[in-house]
């Protein structure tokens, strides 16, 4: 798949024969299948389509530039956010925790895959691609990038079930800390990203190819084994419908059911009681909403054209060319936008959330300070598990924090 | 050293066939790719055909794909190009030529011509 | 296909002058394994082609440092510091980058 975060070829790309199965487009990542010499049945070479170099060649560059700027935004930015949920006692707390465990799986994606991707960009090769430590990366690599893709998806559904679980049982509002039951949607969300992203390490290896007798290696997917066979049959269309359309269908659906509940209790003698309490639960789930839109947004144009590549372009058709480039640039144009979801939550928390954006700036200053003004008086209760300070005394210091410490 | 000699070339008539052979020497044959080149006698060079180092992959030049067939023996350190249906636009200098990434050797050349 | 555009066609001068031989693309021929495949072969009267520079910039070997290759792209140029008598000749460029790979209609050098 590309080296993009949701793909290899890749962009990787031999020739012209590159990223899908034998196909022209270089799709990255090097490297859905990174730069191989894929040839046709035949084993005869065909011609080019030349939009594809120039397009390449352009992109190269870009890329590289738009890489390294994430790099830098997403791991200050998502650093930054887990130092200030991790510091600071009032942002301990369900959302809080699924907005962490979001932050933390972009943040290894941006450390180790992005580097990688850039290397590839530049030196037009996989890293270490004669030794052990390149077999190493070129299954780590896609791993990650569908583990943090997977830790991203699943969690945004966690946060919009939490979001309707708030709505539904208004009485219960919780404490400092994260809900045990938090606690092990998370844990379940990473187990579970990585063991959707297992296919990825096993079907990725070095493959060696040979272009003008001198011999190349590169990292692509190759199936060996029915199952990955399949696999490698049926990505796209598992990717675009677990990796997108469901985080999008699941908050769609609770959304939904948020709205009726919301809705069917509106002129309840509990909910005036409430009505602050409610109000920053709006604020939260308006937030929860903000990043399943930015998400969607950023990979849309990817996942589209891979679909677009597998129903609409014939590579055997003489008048392709025109197709393809439009294809590639809309590829690249993806690739972008979705690596750049890795980077663009904490932004959009500074935005969206008066709490976040408080913690952010004093924390980028110096270190993110507790301000009472920032807290609202809500009564505790429910188990909750701290992660740090299991203080019985520092209970009462914090009272003022609330479940929805997001506003 | 590195030896290529070309083989084959002659006089032919409009839709004949030739089989052009270049024996190689002073390289492990079996590790490159080779090619034929030719040269038109205004003196163009168009690359013919060529072929990876287990013969599993080859390319041709449009104009003589179907026509002509690049085939490698690595026992014999020989190359082969098999030219059927020869047209007047194959008259040429016919070299085979060694290649690691670059044409690095040639040989001197066999010369074919298609007339009637 | 990829046209190697070479220019001059014909290039005058006295031994021990410098000279260019220009070589433009029609299109990048970045190969994508991030290689330029861009070649220059001497062809000497009643010779074969005989390689001079492969991969833009890179000298075969036994080949004098005279000559020198750069550009990148679509632009090539090879570089002559002082033509020597041997070098005189056919000068052709050829992109292996992407197929049909495709060589310039060639500059031939020759003594004022």
């Known amino acids: 798949d590309n080296p993009e975060r949701y793909s290899t070829n890749l962009s990787n790309h031999v020739d012209d024969f590159t990223t899908f199965r034998g196909t022209e487009l270089s799709f990255l990542v090097t490297t859905h299948q990174p730069t191989n010499l894929v040839l046709p049945s035949n084993g005869s070479m065909h011609n080019y389509c030349p939009q594809q170099t120039k397009i390449t060649s352009a992109f190269k560059y870009i890329n590289t530039v738009i890489s390294c700027t994430i790099f830098i935004v997403g791991m200050v930015g998502n650093a930054t956010l887990l130092r200030i949920i991790y510091q600071n006692k009032c942002m301990r707390n369900g959302p809080n925790a699924l907005i962490a465990s979001l932050a933390l799986g972009d943040l290894i994606y941006v450390v180790i895959d992005l580097p990688i991707n850039v290397f590839k960009l530049l030196a037009g090769r996989w890293p270490f691609d004669h030794n052990d430590f390149g077999v190493f990366l070129c299954k780590l690599f896609p791993f990650l990038q569908k583990s943090s893709v997977g830790i991203t998806v699943l969690n945004l559904c966690a946060l919009s079930v939490d979001r309707y679980r708030a709505v539904a049982s208004w009485s219960r509002v919780q404490g400092i800390g994260i809900p045990l039951v938090t606690a092990i949607e998370i844990v379940s969300i990473w187990i579970l990203s990585f063991i959707l992203a297992i296919p990825e390490a096993i079907g990725f290896v070095m493959v060696p190819f040979e272009y003008r007798g001198e011999q190349h290696k590169t990292c692509m997917l190759n199936a060996t084994s029915k199952f990955m066979e399949f696999y490698q049959d049926v990505k796209d269309w598992w990717l675009f419908g677990f990796y997108f359309c469901m985080p999008l269908v699941c908050t769609a659906i609770f959304y939904t059911l948020m709205t009726c509940e919301m809705l069917n209790r509106r002129n309840g003698s509990l909910r005036i009681a409430l009505s602050e309490h409610l109000k920053q639960r709006r604020e939260v789930a308006k937030t929860v909403f903000c990043l399943v839109v930015i998400f969607a947004l950023c990979w849309f144009p990817l996942h589209l054209s891979r679909i677009l590549k597998k129903t609409v372009y014939n590579e055997m058709d003489k008048n392709r060319c025109e197709l393809l480039s439009f294809l590639l640039l809309m590829d690249y144009i993806g690739i972008n936008l979705a690596t750049m979801n890795s980077c663009i939550n904490p932004i959009a928390l500074y935005f969206v959330s008066k709490k976040f954006k408080n913690c952010f700036q004093s924390c980028l200053c110096c270190c993110c300070y507790q301000s009472k003004s920032l807290m609202t008086s809500v009564p505790m209760n429910g188990t909750s598990i701290q992660w740090k300070n299991h203080d019985q005394n520092n209970h009462n210091t914090d009272r003022s924090s609330h479940k929805d410490s997001m506003n | 050293e590195v030896h290529l000699v070309e083989s084959g070339g002659g006089l032919v008539q409009p839709g004949g066939s030739l089989k052009l052979s270049c024996a190689a020497s002073g390289f492990t044959f079996s590790t490159y790719g080779m090619s034929w080149v030719r040269q038109t006698p205004d003196k163009r060079l168009e690359l013919v055909a060529t072929i990876n180092t287990n013969g599993g992959t080859t390319y041709y030049r449009d104009s003589v794909k179907g026509r002509f067939t690049i085939s490698r023996d690595n026992a014999k350190n020989t190359l082969y190009l098999q030219m059927s249906s020869l047209k007047s636009d194959d008259t040429a200098m016919y070299y085979c030529?060694?290649?690691?990434?670059?044409?690095?050797?040639w040989g001197q050349g066999t010369s074919v011509t298609v007339s009637s | 296909d990829v046209l190697m555009t070479q220019t001059p066609l014909s290039l005058p001068v006295s031994l021990g002058d410098h000279a260019s031989i220009s070589c433009r693309s029609s299109q990048y021929i970045v190969h994508s394994t991030g290689t330029t495949y861009l070649e220059w072969y001497l062809q000497k009267p009643g010779q074969s082609p005989q390689l001079l520079i492969y991969?833009?910039?890179n000298r075969f070997s036994g080949v004098p440092d005279r000559f020198t290759g750069s550009g990148s792209g679509t632009d090539f140029t090879l570089r002559i510091s002082r033509v020597e008598a041997e070098d005189l000749g056919v000068y052709f460029c050829?992109?292996?980058?992407?197929?049909?790979?495709?060589f310039g209609s060639g500059t031939k050098l020759e003594i004022k």
């Open positions: 030529a060694r290649d690691y990434g670059a044409m690095d050797y």
């Open positions: 991969k833009v910039s």
């Open positions: 050829f992109q292996g980058s992407h197929f049909p790979f495709t």
